[in-house]
Each structure stands twice: as structure tokens, then as C-alpha cells.
Interface confidence: low
Amino acid sequence: GDTRPRFLEQVKHECHFFNGTERVRFLDRYFYHQEEYVRFDSDVGEYRAVTELGRPDAEYWNSQKDLLEQKRAAVDTYCRHNYGVGESFTVQRRVYPEVTVYPAKTQPLQHHNLLVCSVNGFYPGSIEVRWFRNGQEEKTGVVSTGLIQNGDWTFQTLVMLETVPRSGEVYTCQVEHPSLTSPLTVEWRARSESAQSKMLSGVGGFVLGLLFLGAGLFIYFRNQKGHSGLQPTGFLS
Amino acid sequence: IKEEHVIIQAEFYLNPDQSGEFMFDFDGDEIFHVDMAKKETVWRLEEFGRFASFEAQGALANIAVDKANLEIMTKRSNYTPITNVPPEVTVLTNSPVELREPNVLICFIDKFTPPVVNVTWLRNGKPVTTGVSETVFLPREDHLFRKFHYLPFLPSTEDVYDCRVEHWGLDEPLLKHWEFDAPSPLPETTENVVCALGLTVGLVGIIIGTIFIIKGVRKSNAAERRGPL
């Protein structure tokens, strides 16, 4: 492979915004490999060496009054300017989440399971995901992947609830996000559709069978009782 | 007080590869980068270009300065080379996986330097290039780099995928595997027993009940035909 030594220069011109553009901090940062060696901080107003490596630059740049004036003005001419240009598609960008709930493991009822609330494709990253069991918030046994950046201006997160699902329980994943006017909820019931249809079929069949049996016995015995006085000669050969 | 938003104009120049990058970052997402070869602005999302513009030529001038700076710093540091930091690699999907529902595999390459990496998608061990895309090198707060690679795919139980990453910090290529995890249906023992018993009892009940109803009705009819003595 290519084993030649590598040399890397990085420059980061940073704009930090607080309360919109009310307070802005500008940083002009220079790095050799990963080591920052000199920086201009708008809170300081001049270049400062971060390591000994940057001392000559701090001295050289601080001697250039035009350069310093340009950097001191950068909070307005560069930061606030760029914020204004990009605000509509960055700061104001809103994409609502898609929410899906499913069990991580396919376990029978009354066994330990992880209920997954998958929240996908949202922007910005600030989000609140809560779990409820039968309307009561579950705070213990909640595990999250944390915020995952997809690299395409969307985020995703998985929030899991460790639980022992019992028949008839209703689990709710509630999501709050800047794109939503009211919380988004998705329910999960502690029984699968196939299990539910099996139970319904079984119980339904059983009840229907009992009804038929009951009706049959009722009709049969009612007729037997109703005609008992007329029967003695009925079986004469 | 924590800042609400951060915009970073991030640049780098790497020798002896003579590779440079110029990009704008908003809260960790790329707004655009400049394609050095084509000398043009490339917006991360197409719609961004409808709201703003950037003169790519300015980025080339900045990179020229970064290059000169690097030569000075290389010499000033007595030619101290960079220490390779190998990447951490994660493969995930864009959304929950459903069979035959289009999805996207994401290979997230993180916490590495220098910003040179070779990434290959493999389907069943063979390289895939159709539809693949990638981001440029994205800056991190610790001044290492991040990068995303994407592969659109149709989930199936037959296919397995790998993201293969080569970096000077790795002794050998790193492969991160992904395959469809088909959920095995629940045993549903109780439900099965209830269903079987219920339907059996039900069926038996219906048959016996029907027999009794028929017999009962016949008996009633016979008595009526004979009438009173």
C-alpha cells in the first residue's frame, strides 16, 4: 500500500448562534493534523496561539490591522449574512417523523420482550419519544439508540421498552417534534392479529357449539316432557 | 447557554495526495461542497440551490492558501506526519425493513483521519455500484472525519450485504455485515390450544346439537300427527 507520510491542514471558520442572531460568536481556527495551533475568537478580538506551533502566525496576523478589522466584523459580514441567506432551508427546515412500533423479539405473552418504537426521517434532531402502558408513562426499562444522523438532512432514532406484555395491554409510543402541532401516537396491543383471530375462532366456535348443543338438548328434552302422558301405547308392537 | 445553531466553513488540504476540500456545515449536516475538479458548487440537497448560490472560484483561492499554509506548517513541525486514526463503521437502514419494500443501506464511517478512505458495497460478496452515493468528508468536533455511503436496495431473505472499508489506520479491510432478519412467528401455544379445543368442541357441539334438534323436532312432529287418544 501507500505508506508515504501524510500532512494535513484544516481550517474551520465557525459561526455560533444564540437566540437566533441576537448573540453571535465567530471563530477562525487553524489546525495541523488534529491540533489547533492558532485561532481568532470574536470574544477576544485578536489572534491567539493555541500551541507554540501557532505563535508566529498570531504575531504576524495581529500586526495586520486591516485583517483584524475584517475578522472583527465577521460576526455581521460573514455569520449574520450567511444565517440570513440559509435560514429558510436550514433553521426553518421541518420534516415530520414516520413512526413504527414492533416487538424486537417474537416472544409469546408473559415473556420478556423489547418493544421498538422506530422514529424515522425527521428534521431537526430535537425530538421527545415516550412510552405508555395502558395510559401510564413507562420510565424504567426504556433504552434508546440516541439520535442517529443519516447524513441527508434527516435523523432517526429507536426507543425500546423492556417489558413483559400481558394479554389485553395497550402500549403507546408518543412522539413530540417541532414539525408536529400535537404529539403523534402509535399503539401496540399485547396480542398478535393471528393470535387474536385464533382466540376468537376458538372461543367463537366453542360458544357456537355450546349454543347448538344447548338448543338441541333444550328442544329434545322439551318435546320429551311435553308429550309424556300420551305415550304408553305409543310403542305397542 | 448552549448555542442553537452552528455554521462551519470547513476546509482541508492533504499532502502528498494534493487533495483539498471546501464545504459548509449546518449543525452537522452538509449544505454544499465545492467540486475542485469541476470548479462547481454541489448542493447536498438539490432544492438548496434554489434558495442560495456560492461562487466556487472563491473556494479554490482558499484551498490555495491552505496548501501554502500546510507547506509552512509541515516544515515548522519538523516534518511530523499525521498519525492514522482508523474508522469506526456502522451499517444501518434508512427505515424499518420490510420484505420487497425499497429501502436504503447506510454505511457510516466515523472518527478517522487522514481523510482518505476506500469504501465498497458488497452484495453476496460481489461489489455493487448501481445507485450508490456518498457524502464528502464531514468535519467532527474532535477534528477527525465522518463519511456516509448509501446503497438503495430491495430487502430479500436471499441477499446479504457488506460495507467494506479500507483506511491506512486499518491492518486489513473492515467489513460490516447486514442481512434481513426475518421474524419467526410467535409459538402462540395458548392461542393454538384454545383455537383447536374451541373449534373441536364447537364442531362437536354443533353436530350433537343439530342431531338433538332434528330428533327433538321429529319427535314433536310425530306426536302432532298422532294427535290425542
Partner: antibody, heavy 120, light 109 residues
Framework: QVELKESGPALVKPTQTLTLTCTFS??????????VGWIRQPPGKALEWLAL???????YYSTSLKTRLTISKDTSKNQVVLTMTNMDPVDTATYYC????????????WGQGTLVTVSS | DIVLTQPPSVSGAPGQRVTISCSGS????????VTWYQQLPGTAPKLLIY???QRPSGVPDRFSGSKSGTSASLAITGLQSEDEADYYC?????????FGGGTKLTVLG
């Protein structure tokens, strides 16, 4: 403002050693990234780079003239000195000193030049 | 040593556009930035273009530079009589500065 001025003999004999001094003002050779170089131009011909000294005393020489050239600096006097041994009539030229700024690659300020004739 | 190749001369009438080419190799122009100097008769060279296409303050925007691969070019639009001079391209690698042979620009008429 930045100024550079070359000084030295106008006439040297073949085989002799030429010593040229560049005295500058408006910048310091202790400033990171700054260098001072020498370039010559024979009458009616092209510019030819000879040597350069950096702020940190690193020295660079033209490959074809390396064995004959020596460059040095005196930061306190704001001077750079170039010596060239074994002079020959083909070395007759105008010798310029010039500043290479922090972002190396160009010479942004030049002296007026001094004509050196090599003749017996 | 002349490492970069320039045409010995170019000419143009006032108001016209002229270009001067400069050809090098992967190790100089291909890997680094190009500088252009103007040398008026009897004077020292003056910096005209640096970093391929950047103009120092005071240089008219009639002068522009570009680079592609291992070649560079200087374009002068709206030619004026005072543009008559010698033009030199220059590049470098880590420790060697290299010049072109120079191009004499003649303004006709």
C-alpha cells in the same frame, strides 16, 4: 511599505566570487512563512531563479548552480546575502532580490536589480 | 534552466484579446500554483497573477489567469499600448522555483 534594494560590485573578473546584499524594509524575515529569493536575468534573456532563504533559515538552491551558491541572512540588519563562486562571463546578468510572502509560490515585491558584468 | 514553455512572442491590436500559454509538467504546474509577472522595458518584474487566477490589488481586471492540468494561460482583454511588455509564468514544487522563457507582447498600430 515593502522595499528591497540590491547592492554589490558592478564588475567582477572570471573565477572570482560575487557577493550581493539585499537590504529590505517594510517586513521582517522572522515572520513565519516569509522568504527572500534571488533571481537573475542575462541581457535580453529570461528570468532564472537562483536561491531562496526562509524565515526559519531553510535554504533552497537552483539544481544547476547549487555547488556555487550560498545564501544567508542577518535578521537584525534586515539583510540577505548571496555569494556565487567561480564567476564566468555567462553569469553576466541583472540580479534581483524579491520577497516571497507567507503564502509561498509567488514573488510579490522585487528590488530594482543590479547589473553585474563578468569580464577580465 | 527554462522548465516552463511559453511562446516567444504574441501580438494584438488595441482593444483586442490576447492569451499567453505556459506549459509545464505534472511535477510543477500539475502539482502547484502558477504565477504571472509583467516586465515593462528597463524595469523589474511586477506580480500580475498569483495562485493561478488571483489578482493583487491594483492590477486591472483585464488581466486574468487560468490553469488546466499541466498548462496555464494568461488572458488580456481590451489590449492597451501600455500592456506592451515581457510576460513570465512561474511555478514551483516544494523547494524549486521555475520560470518560463518569457513572452514578448507587442501592441500593434
Amino acid at each position: 511599505q515593502v522595499e528591497l534594494k540590491e547592492s554589490g560590485p558592478a564588475l567582477v573578473k572570471p573565477t572570482q566570487t560575487l557577493t550581493l546584499t539585499c537590504t529590505f524594509s517594510g517586513f521582517s524575515l522572522s515572520t513565519s512563512g516569509v522568504g527572500v529569493g534571488w533571481i537573475r536575468q542575462p541581457p535580453g534573456k529570461a528570468l532564472e531563479w537562483l536561491a531562496l532563504i526562509d524565515w526559519d533559515d531553510d535554504k533552497y538552491y537552483s539544481t544547476s548552480l547549487k555547488t556555487r551558491l550560498t545564501i544567508s541572512k542577518d535578521t537584525s540588519k534586515n539583510q540577505v546575502v548571496l555569494t556565487m563562486t567561480n564567476m564566468d562571463p555567462v553569469d553576466t546578468a541583472t540580479y534581483y532580490c524579491a520577497r516571497s510572502p507567507r503564502y509561498r509560490g509567488a514573488f510579490d515585491y522585487w528590488g530594482q536589480g543590479t547589473l553585474v558584468t563578468v569580464s577580465s | 534552466d527554462i522548465v516552463l514553455t511559453q511562446p516567444p512572442s504574441v501580438s494584438g491590436a488595441p482593444g483586442q484579446r490576447v492569451t499567453i500559454s505556459c506549459s509545464g509538467s505534472e511535477s510543477n504546474i500539475g502539482a502547484n500554483y502558477v504565477t504571472w509577472y509583467q516586465q515593462l522595458p528597463g524595469t523589474a518584474p511586477k506580480l500580475l497573477i498569483y495562485d493561478n487566477n488571483q489578482r493583487p490589488s491594483g492590477v486591472p481586471d483585464r488581466f486574468s489567469g487560468s490553469k488546466s492540468g499541466t498548462s496555464a494561460s494568461l488572458a488580456i482583454t481590451g489590449l492597451q499600448s501600455e500592456d506592451e511588455a515581457d510576460y513570465y509564468c512561474q511555478s514551483y514544487d516544494y523547494d524549486h522555483y521555475v520560470f518560463g522563457g518569457g513572452t514578448k507582447l507587442t501592441v500593434l498600430g
